[in-house]
């Protein structure tokens, strides 16, 4: 969490941002909140990016003002216009690109004063893994697949029964470049699995950590997966 305060001149206002991550090719949100004002027409929101000449986005007098917007953000940004009055300056970003990573500044002017806060935005690719029994294999085998990751993640297998065991000798992981030549499909195979056990396939890079679990018994197969973004800190 980054909390910024205003500078000289008018009174300062508190602006708060949260570091976040964007998934390449999907839509993202850059979070920013501020002390609200009672008049929408008195609020100015400016989003800036370090190293970019033009603005990322500007909102003033109750509407967008994109005359100074940098070309790389054209047609890709919006604030939640109906939530500005309650202090939400968060920015919607369409079709996140690798090059969108960097330091952003959320700069606010209201009748109460000015304030700003920086936000670190990471970009990459992350997706939920799915673990299945590979019935085509000669021995009892599990196959963990996740369609989109970047940068290249690490893959680690674990089991409930053999806690702390190292499965690197009995697993094989491959990374296949996707058609857009950035993200990769992750496939990891675990051999010699035993029934009545829960296995976990853990995929992690510096942006996200995802886990796919599978419980194999003689009568059923249960699956569960979850994904967690790393380093979401407020400012």
């Amino acid at each position: 969490l980054i909390i910024g305060f205003g500078i000289s001149g008018r009174h300062s206002i508190t602006v708060t941002t949260v570091a976040s991550a964007g998934n390449i090719g999907e839509d993202g949100i850059l979070s920013c909140t501020f002390e609200p004002d009672i008049k929408l027409s008195d609020i100015v929101i400016q989003w800036l990016k370090e190293g970019v000449l033009g603005l990322v986005h500007e909102f003033k007098e109750g509407k967008d003002e994109l005359s100074e917007q940098d070309e790389m953000f054209r047609g890709r940004t919006a604030v939640f216009a109906d939530q500005v009055i309650v202090g939400n300056a968060s920015l919607r970003l369409k079709n996140v690109q690798l090059t969108d990573a960097g330091t952003y500044k959320c700069y606010i002017i209201t009748s109460k004063g000015k304030g700003n806060a920086n936000l670190e935005y990471k970009t990459g690719a992350f997706s939920m893994p799915e673990v299945n029994v590979d019935y085509n294999a000669s021995s009892e085998t599990l196959r963990c697949e996740a369609p989109r990751w970047f940068p290249q993640p690490t893959v680690v297998w674990a089991s409930q029964v053999d806690q702390g065991a190292n499965f690197s000798e009995v697993s094989n992981t491959s990374f296949e470049l996707n058609s857009e030549n950035v993200t990769m499909k992750v496939v990891s195979v675990l051999y010699n699995v035993t029934i009545n056990n829960t296995y976990s396939c853990m995929i992690e890079n510096d942006i996200a950590k995802a886990t796919g679990d599978i419980k194999v018994t003689e009568s059923e197969i249960k699956r569960r997966s979850h994904l967690q973004l790393l380093n979401s800190k407020a400012s």
Epitope: E26, D27, K63, D64, L66, S67, G75, T77, N95, E180
Partner: antibody, heavy 120, light 107 residues
Framework: QLQLQESGPGLVKPSETLSLTCTVS??????????WGWIRQPPGKGLEWIGN???????YYNPSLKSRVTISVDTSKNQFSLKLSSVTAADTAVYYC????????????WGQGILVTVSS | EIVMTQSPATLSVSPGERATLSCRAS??????LAWYQQKPGQAPRLLIY???TRATGIPARFSGSGSGTEFTLTISSLQSEDFAVYYC?????????FGGGTKVEIK
Amino acid sequence: QLQLQESGPGLVKPSETLSLTCTVSGGSIKSGSYYWGWIRQPPGKGLEWIGNIYYSGSTYYNPSLKSRVTISVDTSKNQFSLKLSSVTAADTAVYYCAREGSYPNQFDPWGQGILVTVSS
Amino acid sequence: EIVMTQSPATLSVSPGERATLSCRASQSVSSNLAWYQQKPGQAPRLLIYGASTRATGIPARFSGSGSGTEFTLTISSLQSEDFAVYYCQQYHSFPFTFGGGTKVEIK
């Protein structure tokens, strides 16, 4: 409510320049949350996005037409214009102007369209 | 550029019946998709944007769903005024592109 109206010649000779104007009424072209776009539709075919302009004059064109297209704006007249050079019969189409959201980028409303035929 | 493919090309439906139109993108467009209705001799009219949000004044019988590469426009009970051509459009990346259209005709 906001209305758009295309105007210009309905017949253009091959190799010449097609020129159309879109007049906006019921609202200002300087409304900051919108771009102003051109879309065309050859007879009996689908729609093709040509490009857009912001009231400040910044433009974005469809790469397939970029070398031949110019879109300009006249805020004093609440108008924006399309020029398409070196036209051929393949440019025969109904040309529509429309307001385009800055994001989401949907087109709404549209002009009623103007048929431009390229023929000698 | 992203290629949008609509199916079927023609859909024959009786008034009062349900119509389901499909639109597929050649790569993910997230939820950055709009649907338009066009009647002969008229300009297209916006029905849906953001894949599922109805535009102002559009009746509740029109609904949109989907995200990524697969999208659906559903007309729950076709009225006589709904027989027209329907287009999907992606605005995920430039250049914005439209599908080839689905003609909904009276059965």
